[in-house]
């Protein structure tokens, strides 16, 4: 008799999930020699242990603690770049500005980036058919809880000036429901973080509006100020030129507004 399987609303576990996590871990330790003490088999075992045989709507941050411990990593606390709804540009930036880090530049973020995973209660199987959707099914699913956990820890580690890249093409440039808005903003430590500097990335070629005056940015400023952290905001009118100038700061065209 075929076992009844829960149908969730979201896509199933990414194919080759175990192989991908293990391969990513090994790659990461190859290109980041300071992390070569990490045992990738133990990392995979801890990752698996966080969600296998557990109901995929009943995952807690506690489930991920063994993995968090194994993936403990020190990044320069004053070189952190947060982002919201503009991941690709943030990653292009840290690829050029090598001394700055997004969450996905750390081992745990790198391992899970763009992957989906979930298991089933009481069976050791990985569910490749479907996984819970955050909105339609439940928020305490393996993927959401993972990102909430690592994002909180990443924000807690930040100090001095923290940068955040925001997508100026979205209707809500700052979204309270994003991971940045719901987790990271609230876990910046006022005793360590002096300033949050937002970079609002413009999408249109001829868009010369000051998006730092957007109501959602004012809302972000209010939240941050109430937490005794200073706030500053910059418009990045030309993201392509911005990246080019990060690459070649001495270029004569890089002295003007970007």
């Amino acid at each position: 008799v075929p076992r009844w399987r829960q149908q969730w609303s979201g896509p199933g576990t990414t194919k080759r999930f175990p192989e991908t996590v293990l391969a990513r871990c090994v790659k990461y330790t190859e290109i980041h020699p300071e992390m070569r003490h990490v045992d990738c088999q133990s990392v995979w075992d801890a990752f698996k242990g966080a969600f296998i045989s557990k109901h995929p709507c009943n995952i807690t941050e506690e489930d991920y603690q063994p993995l968090m411990k194994l993936g403990t990593q020190t990044v320069p606390c004053n070189k952190i770049l947060l982002w919201s709804r503009i991941k690709d540009l943030a990653h292009q930036f840290t690829q050029v500005q090598r001394d700055m880090f997004t969450l996905e530049d750390t081992l745990l973020g790198y391992l899970a980036d763009d992957l989906t995973w979930c298991g089933e209660f009481n069976t050791s199987k990985i569910n490749y058919q479907s996984c819970p959707d955050w909105r339609k099914d439940c928020s305490n699913n393996p993927v959401s809880v993972f990102w909430k956990t690592v994002s909180r820890r990443f924000a807690e580690a930040a100090c001095d000036v923290v940068h955040v890249m925001l997508n100026g093409s979205r209707s809500k440039i700052f979204d309270k429901n994003s991971t940045f808005g719901s987790v990271e903003v609230h876990n910046l430590q006022p005793e360590k973080v002096q300033t949050l500097e937002a970079w609002v990335i413009h999408g249109g070629r001829e868009d010369s509006r000051d998006l730092c005056q957007d109501p959602t940015i004012k809302e972000l400023e209010s939240i941050i100020s109430k937490r005794n952290i200073q706030f500053s905001c910059k418009n990045i009118y030309r993201p392509d030129k911005f990246l080019q100038c990060v690459k070649n700061p001495e270029d004569s065209s890089c002295t003007s507004e970007i």
Partner: antibody
Amino acid sequence: QMQLVQSGAEVKKTGSSVKVSCKASGYTFTDYIMHWVRQAPGQALEWMGWIDPEYGSTDYAQKFQDRVTITADRSMSTAYMELSSLRSEDTAMYYCARVAIITTVASGGFAYWGQGTLVTVSS
Amino acid sequence: DIVMTQTPLSLSVTPGQPASISCQSSESLLHSNGKTYLNWYLQKPGQPPQLLIYWMSTRAAGVPDRFSGSGSGTDFTLKISRVEAEDVGVYYCQQFLEYPPTFGQGTKLEIK
């Protein structure tokens, strides 16, 4: 079996660019970092840079930073190394290489190499 | 960058006799994980290099047991217990403790 097959020999003029390809087979291309190493005639080996084919992220040796670009085409399981502003000193054999994985640990040694691509730069 | 220095730059050995190549690094290659990131390669004429030894003393797959690697944090030795005709070529040591990975200048082994 695991293979890295490189493009053929090239003769280039000073100041031009060259793009060397390295086609991988026998393994999942995105699971491994690809490195590029060169060797000028009668000289030692010199590491140029790496690419993570899954993400497209790269890192280059300081010496080549301004002139080298390493890319990857996941659909073709192929890595590319482009060197610009060629000078006579760039005449060399160019190799792609990757490590072996020993029980879920990168060995730290280049266990697999392409056959090499000879690039000759003439004025 | 870590500098790798090999000695001798060439040696000529009678078949069946032992051979020894030294390599010195400008910094210790011992990682906190207990592994020493020193590799040895042999490059035969007209071929790409082939990995002989990694982690200072672990033989790569298919490498005959007449090849052995030893050393400490900065001083390393590749030994061939009994040289055979097929061992001719240039031997390179390489550090992979940190980026950029760097190679020694090579030691050419000839048969007498």
